[in-house]
C-alpha cells in the first residue's frame, strides 16, 4: 500500500468551539438553499477502496478542491459565516501542504474526480451542495487526519 507522510493535523484544530460552530452554521445555511437531496458528495462512495492510512490524503484533495473551486468563487455569499470560515479552512489546507503519498494514488484520484465531476455537472447547485456538506468535510478531516 502507498505510504502517506505528513498527513496529520493537530486535534486542537477541531476543538475550537467558535470556528466549529461557524463552519456548521455555514453548512446549515447553504443546505437550506440546496434543493437536490438525492446526491451526497461526502459519503461511503468517496472512501471506497481507500485504506484508513490514505484517507487524510484523500480529504486533503477534497479540501483543496472545495476551497479553490467552490468556496473562493462563492465567497461573497452566506455572510457573515463565509468570511470567518474560509481563512480557517485555508489554514488547514496550508497545514496539509506537505501531505503526500509515496506510490500509486490513482484509486484516490479516481474517487476525488467523481466528486469533482458531480459538483461540476450540477453547476452552481453543486457548489451550494458542497458548501452544505462543510460539516461532513470538517468531520471527515478530523476523523482522517488526527
Amino acid at each position: 500500500a502507498p505510504i502517506s507522510s505528513h498527513c496529520r493535523l493537530d486535534k486542537s484544530n477541531f476543538q475550537q468551539p467558535y470556528i466549529t460552530n461557524r463552519t456548521f452554521m455555514l453548512a446549515k445555511e447553504a443546505s437550506l438553499a440546496d434543493n437536490n437531496t438525492d446526491v451526497r458528495l461526502i459519503g461511503e462512495k468517496l472512501f471506497h477502496g481507500v485504506s484508513m492510512s490514505e484517507r487524510c490524503y484523500l480529504m486533503k484533495q477534497v479540501l483543496n478542491f472545495t476551497l479553490e473551486e467552490v468556496l473562493f468563487p462563492q465567497s461573497d455569499r452566506f455572510q457573515p459565516y463565509m468570511q470567518e470560515v474560509v481563512p480557517f479552512l485555508a489554514r488547514l489546507s496550508n497545514r496539509l501542504s506537505t501531505c503526500h503519498i509515496e506510490g500509486d494514488d490513482l484509486h484516490i484520484q479516481r474517487n476525488v474526480q467523481k466528486l469533482k465531476d458531480t459538483v461540476k455537472k450540477l453547476g452552481e447547485s453543486g457548489e451550494i451542495k458542497a458548501i452544505g456538506e462543510l460539516d461532513l468535510l470538517f468531520m471527515s478531516l478530523r476523523n482522517a487526519c488526527i
Epitope: F72, Q83, P87, R91
Partner: antibody, heavy 120, light 111 residues
Framework: QVQLVQSGAEKKPGASVKVSCKAS????????MHWVRQAPGQGLEWVGW????????FYAQKFRGRVTMTRDTSINTAYMELSRLGSDDTAVYYC??????????????WGRGTMVTVSS | QAVLTQPSSVSGAPRQRVTISCTGS?????????VHWYQQLPGTAPKLLIY???NRPSGVPDRFSGSKSGTSASLAITGLQAEDEADYYC???????????FGTGTQLTVL
Amino acid sequence: QVQLVQSGAEKKPGASVKVSCKASGYTFTDYYMHWVRQAPGQGLEWVGWINPYTGGAFYAQKFRGRVTMTRDTSINTAYMELSRLGSDDTAVYYCAREPERFGDSTGQVWGRGTMVTVSS
Amino acid sequence: QAVLTQPSSVSGAPRQRVTISCTGSSSNIGAGYGVHWYQQLPGTAPKLLIYGNSNRPSGVPDRFSGSKSGTSASLAITGLQAEDEADYYCYHWDKEQSGYVFGTGTQLTVL
C-alpha cells in the same frame, strides 16, 4: 509578520479621495478586508468590506453610491475611494483584515489609519 | 440605521469590577450571530478584545470577559487597571442591513 501599511494623510477640497492599504505577511486573497472610519472625537463606523479573491465588495447603507472598494492582487493592495466629500467625511480611515477567530494567533490586524481632511 | 446602544461613559477605581452594556435588537444581537468587543486606547487603532460573545483572543487577559442574553450583551472587566482606560465598542453583524454595525462606544475612566 502580518502588516497593513496605509497611504499618507490627505487634504481634499471636496471631490474624492482614494486611500490605499498594502498587505504583507499572509495570503492576501484568503481574508476579507474591512474599512472603518473615525471622525475626530467620535466613535467607530463600519464603511464596508472587499473580498480580495473575487473583488466583490459590500458597503454600509450610509455610503452606498459614493464609496468604491477595489483591490490589486498583483501588489496585495486594497483601495477605498470616497466621492462627493463633505466636511463630515473628515476622519481617520482604517483598513482592517478580517480577524482570525481560531487558533492561537486570533486577533485582528489594523492599518495605522489615514487621516482625510476635507476643507475648502 | 440600526444602532447598538452603549453607555457613553463608565468609571471605576483600580481593582474594581466594571461592566459595559450593549443593547441591540432582534436583527443584530438577538439574531445570534455573536457579539465582538473592541478596545481602543487613546491615539491607537482598535484591538479585538472579545469575539463570538465570550471568546478571548490570545494575549487578552482573563480579566476581560463577555456575555450575551437576548438582545443585549455585556463586557466585564475585573481587577481594573490604569491601562484599561480606553474606549470600548461592541460590534455585530446586522442581518437587516447585511453589514456590520459598531456600538455607540463607551469611555472607561479609571479613577
